[in-house]
């Protein structure tokens, strides 16, 4: 087909981040044309000569996708109709971090937005207490995350109290050679408290609470993604 | 400033070889692809390859595949073009050019190519 | 291989406009850009996706692309504007356009 008028059409993107080893998401929305057939979708990432991904047609075409990514990308394909262009990305590794760009064609037009994507690992952390050691001591404790991270404990009695020098943190390289095991030990833990083991890179932020009474302790944990609007 | 800088043209007789090479500065040089383009006296311009910013990959124009080798060295931020066999019709300014997406934003100021018996 | 086609030479008078074309198959359905060349000086970028226009550029320049034509306007033309200028595109590889030359009456 071809694009008559010289009309711009919008495209918008949200920058995100991609856990290694695991699936991605890189989001992008356009407006919808009412005909499949006329809507092409390219996706692109500055430094690579090939294409990430490319849609046309109501299928994929992937005669000129770049090595570094065959096999790994898909497009919601029942989806774009309704102006969902964006991309599924199988197996993030750390080389898929940098600028993409969303490319749309449709008969209404032309447009395109760049995106932002990271790429690190993260994970929940849990905090237990550990019965092993001689004094009341919890430890927190996060399979995977890369960059090395940053772990600062809090307490709700305490609020803003230095913990550093009560507390022992440790990395351990996982067998891919990348990620890493975060363990962090926090020793002259009181009960009837609440603490918090917090770990940040600049990709992630993870919290892992504990809340320990003399009757009960209550876990609770939550992961956030920085500098992305989802 | 961004700034790229060739060097290596000269005089050359057919089917001898020639590196060209490209200093990059003011950017992060391992994050763009980088591309070759030459111009021959009083013609237009002629896209002769390009690389990916980690240099897996490359392309080529047609009249040039199989003789020149583009390649990169990004700990020296620095481009170069292996030119083997050349011929008369290799002689032209050479730009080397980062690649913006689809187009090129910055270009060298170029060096010249004589390929001449 | 893909070909764009543009007219060898334009004349304008300055404080008028000039308009360059590329012609080339399908072309509003690709990424088009525009170099601005003087002599002996390397090109210079000076509209890139159709119709955006890099920073320090005037506003005098701008693009459009549909169909099978793109076009470079310089408005308000300027001796200083004297130049080759050439459209292109991607299509595993750059793709130049034959060049026009732009002349100040």
């Known amino acids: 087909f071809g694009i008559s008028g010289r009309h711009s059409i919008t495209v918008t993107t949200v920058a995100s981040a991609g856990n290694i080893g695991e699936d991605g998401i890189l989001s992008c929305t356009f407006e919808p044309d009412i005909k499949l057939s006329d809507i092409v979708i390219q996706w692109l990432k500055e430094g690579v000569l090939g294409l990430v991904h490319e849609f046309k047609e109501g299928k994929d075409e992937l005669s000129e996708q770049d090595e570094m990514f065959r096999g790994r990308t898909a497009v919601f394909a029942d989806q774009v109709i309704v102006g969902n262009a964006s991309l599924r990305l199988k197996n993030v590794q750390l080389t898929d971090a940098g600028t993409y760009k969303c490319y749309i064609i449709t008969s209404k037009g032309k447009g395109n937005a760049n995106l932002e994507y990271k790429t690190g690992a993260f994970s929940m952390p849990e905090v237990n207490v550990d019965y092993n050691a001689s004094s009341e001591t919890l430890r927190c404790e996060a399979p995977r995350w890369f960059p090395q991270p940053t772990v600062v404990w809090a307490s709700q009695v305490d609020q803003g109290a230095n913990f550093s020098e009560v507390s022992n943190t440790s990395f351990e390289l996982n067998s891919e050679n990348v990620t890493m095991k975060v363990v962090s030990v926090l020793y002259n833990v009181t009960i009837n408290n609440t603490y918090s083991c917090m770990i940040e890179n600049d990709i992630a932020k993870a919290t892992g609470d504990i809340k320990v009474t003399e009757s009960e302790i209550k876990r609770r944990s939550h992961l956030q993604l920085l500098n992305s609007k989802a | 400033e961004v700034q790229l800088v060739e060097s290596g043209g000269g005089v050359v007789q057919p089917g001898r070889s020639l590196r060209l090479s490209c200093a990059a500065s003011g950017f992060t040089f391992g994050d763009r692809a980088m591309n070759w383009v030459r111009q021959a006296p009083g013609k237009g311009l002629e896209w002769v390859s390009a690389i990916s910013s980690s240099g897996t990959t490359s392309y080529y124009a047609d009249s040039v595949k199989g003789r020149f080798t583009i390649s990169r060295d990004n700990s020296k931020n620095t481009l170069y073009l292996q030119m083997n066999s050349l011929r008369a019709e290799d002689t032209a300014v050479y730009y080397c050019?980062?690649?913006?997406?689809?187009?090129?934003?910055?270009w060298g100021q170029g060096t010249t190519v004589t390929v001449s018996s | 291989s893909y070909e764009l086609t543009q007219p060898p030479s334009v004349s304008v008078a300055p404080g008028k406009t000039a308009r360059i074309t590329c012609g080339g198959n399908?072309?509003?359905?690709?990424?088009v850009h525009w170099y601005q060349q003087k002599p002996g000086q390397a090109p210079v970028l000076v509209v890139y996706d159709d119709s955006d226009r890099p920073s320090g550029i005037p506003e005098r320049f701008s693009g459009s692309n549909s169909g099978n034509t793109a076009t470079l306007t310089i408005s308000r033309v300027e001796a200083g504007d004297e130049a080759d200028y050439y459209c292109q595109v991607w299509d595993r590889g750059m793709i130049f356009g034959t060049g026009t030359k732009l002349t100040v009456l």
């Open positions: 399908n072309i509003g359905s690709k990424s």
């Open positions: 050019a980062r690649k913006r997406w689809y187009g090129m934003d910055v």
